[in-house]
């Protein structure tokens, strides 16, 4: 007999063909011989089966000798052997209906686990293979678990259920609640305005929660809360902000913070957390601030950076249009008795300039 796989909630067509391309008597019954539907004259008649209100047939195909039964809004319990009686012959079709659902909400925080559960008819032994949007393959039986979701797991998961060499495909949309970046670094010259942005990697109709930015300044012994805020339907409102520095926050998404001036005492790293309503756990984004200062004091020209820099970064002092250069993999460089002219202080990573500051050295008479 023919095997057909169906999806819970879906519609399936069970085909039944007669050799003669004309209207003829036909009936569909279940394995208990209860009539589901059939033909009486030119009318489609329904039997006492539980399926009858969800079963139909395509009249215009009867002339082609096709007496299919269409079952709408499939249920697991519709799994059965169905018998089509036409032209004094019986055709059997085994229908197996499967359902695949996420155990929890499909909006999950980064790091949380996802469990997919397969509903299947008794006596079946299906296998399941799921592919994440990023191309990760996971196999399982009645359950499939993804222990730690990453932001690249956001999107449509395609799961294939196999039984008796037949397959049926499920698509499940998973939204991983996370910031677009795990970490970002802002490089600024002393005195410049600093913009911090925290774009989200997802969109929700209603977004409500609360957040806080904790800051660990390089010069400070402990971290402190710089700002706390509320988020209501994508509108941001500040709850509390420190006096120094006096941060400003944008009223709309993406979350946006402005520090009026980059100063050495602010250089360091922060952690922005966002707790969403009805979700356990918090979203995190790390943000770093690196501040550069170039000064001339008496016969000494100095360039310094504060904040979290990697040891492989190079700090250089260079005289414009001249070969004179001092470079160090350090947080400060200096030149004694510098030549007059425009000097450039450069913070670079493998030749790529991250930050530069110019200082004019005037001749001393």
């Amino acid at each position: 007999k023919k095997v057909v796989l169906g999806k819970k909630g879906d519609t399936v067509e069970l085909t039944c063909n007669a050799s003669q391309k004309k209207n003829t008597q036909f009936h569909w019954k279940n394995s208990n011989q209860i009539k589901i539907l059939g033909i009486q004259g030119l009318f489609l008649t329904k039997g006492p089966s539980k399926l009858s209100d969800r079963a139909d047939s395509r009249k215009s195909l009867w002339d082609q000798g096709c007496f299919s039964m269409i079952i709408k809004n499939l249920k697991i319990e519709d799994s059965d052997t169905y018998i089509c009686e036409v032209e004094n012959k019986k055709e059997e079709v085994e229908l197996l209906v499967f359902g695949l659902t996420a155990n929890s909400d499909t909006h999950l925080l980064e790091g949380q686990s996802l469990t997919l559960t397969l509903e299947s008819p008794p006596g079946s032994s299906p296998s399941v293979k799921c592919r994440s949007p990023g191309g990760k393959n996971i196999q399982g039986g009645r359950t499939i678990s993804v222990p730690q979701l990453e932001r690249q797991d956001s999107g449509t998961w395609t799961c294939t259920v196999s039984q008796d060499q037949k397959t049926v495909e499920f698509k499940i949309d998973i939204v991983v609640l996370a910031f677009q970046k795990a970490s970002s670094t802002v490089y600024k010259k002393e005195g410049e305005q600093v913009e911090f942005s925290f774009p989200l990697a997802f969109t929700l109709e209603k977004l409500t929660g609360s957040g806080e930015l904790w800051w660990q300044a390089e010069r400070a012994s402990s971290s402190k809360s710089w700002i706390t805020f509320d988020l209501k339907n994508k509108e941001v409102s500040v709850k509390r902000v420190t006096q120094d520095p006096k941060l400003q926050m944008g009223k709309k998404l993406p979350l946006h913070l402005t520090l009026p001036q980059a100063l050495p005492q602010y250089a360091g790293s922060g952690n922005l957390t966002l707790a969403l309503e009805a979700k356990t756990g918090k979203l995190h984004q790390e943000v770093n601030l690196v501040v550069m200062r170039a000064t001339q004091f008496q016969e000494n020209l100095t360039c310094e950076v504060w904040g979290p820099t990697s040891p492989k970064l190079t700090l250089s002092l260079k005289l414009e249009n001249k070969g004179a250069t001092v470079s160090k993999q350090a947080k400060a460089v200096w030149v004694l008795n510098p030549e007059a002219g425009m000097w450039q202080c450069l913070l670079s990573d493998s030749g790529q300039v991250l930050l530069e500051s110019n200082i004019k050295v005037v001749p001393t008479w």
Epitope: G9, D10, G41, L42, F43, R58, S60, I70
Partner: antibody, heavy 115, light 107 residues
Framework: QVQLQQWGAGLLKPSETLSLTCAVS????????WSWIRQPPGKGLEWIGE???????NCNPSLKSRVTISVDTSKNQFSLKLSSVTAADTAMYYC?????????WGQGTLVTVSS | DIQMTQTPSSVSASVGDRVTITCRAS??????LAWYQQKPGKAPELLIY???SLQSGVPSRFSGSGSGTDFTLTISSLQPEDFATYFC?????????FGGGTKVESK
């Protein structure tokens, strides 16, 4: 809720090929047939043809020689191509879901054939 | 092909009136008939299927009857939103065909 969203070129020259696509969302794609119907300005409705998820088609004999209907089940989309168009093919073209009757319709695409 | 003949082609009526539209199929189609409503610039909407079954969400003032060759759509008490064009359609055999339409307009 089932939704049908259709698109395609709205202005054609005689002898060109009309090409329209319809995307189905929010419901079952298998088990149903997916139709194309047209309506010339101020006139009645004409069934063009249909396809199911496995690619089985039925077409109106009056148009069959010029009609190609195809399906892309990976995207839940189906398409219509009507070759060698003339001014008589100017109409509003609709996609629709059918079992015996047309219960969900696309928004329609006005196709004008003019030299 | 099955010919679907709709009468009248237009009808003038007032709010609260009872409106009847007929559709004749040649040859007969048992109960494989539907009625649709179409408003200007919109796609048709299914009102009645299988000759007399009311589609979900359609007001009960709409009703359908008939079998074989003669079918009727009745609007028991015409409402302002019912001014539109109505089409019948047979699902008995290919090609699927529609009636020419009946325009219900304000008297």
């Amino acid at each position: 809720q089932v939704q049908l969203q259709q698109w395609g070129a709205g202005l054609l020259k005689p002898s060109e090929t009309l090409s329209l696509t319809c995307a189905v969302s929010g419901g079952s794609f298998s088990g149903y047939y997916w139709s194309w119907i047209r309506q010339p300005p101020g006139k009645g409705l004409e069934w063009i043809g249909e396809i199911n998820h496995s690619g089985s088609t039925n077409c109106n004999p009056s148009l069959k020689s010029r009609v190609t209907i195809s399906v892309d089940t990976s995207k839940n989309q189906f398409s219509l191509k009507l070759s060698s168009v003339t001014a008589a093919d100017t109409a509003m073209y609709y996609c629709a879901r059918v079992l015996n009757f047309f219960d969900y319709w696309g928004q329609g695409t006005l196709v004008t054939v003019s030299s | 092909d099955i010919q679907m003949t709709q009468t009248p082609s237009s009808v003038s009526a007032s709010v609260g009136d009872r409106v009847t539209i007929t559709c004749r199929a040649s040859p007969g189609i048992s109960n494989w008939l539907a009625w649709y409503q179409q408003k200007p610039g919109k796609a048709p909407e299914l009102l009645i299927y299988a000759a007399s079954s009311l589609q979900s969400g359609v007001p009960s003032r709409f009703s359908g009857s008939g079998s074989g060759t003669d079918f009727t759509l009745t609007i028991s008490s015409l409402q302002p939103e019912d001014f539109a064009t109505y089409f019948c359609q047979q699902a008995n055999s290919f090609p699927l065909t529609f009636g020419g339409g009946t325009k219900v307009e304000s008297k």
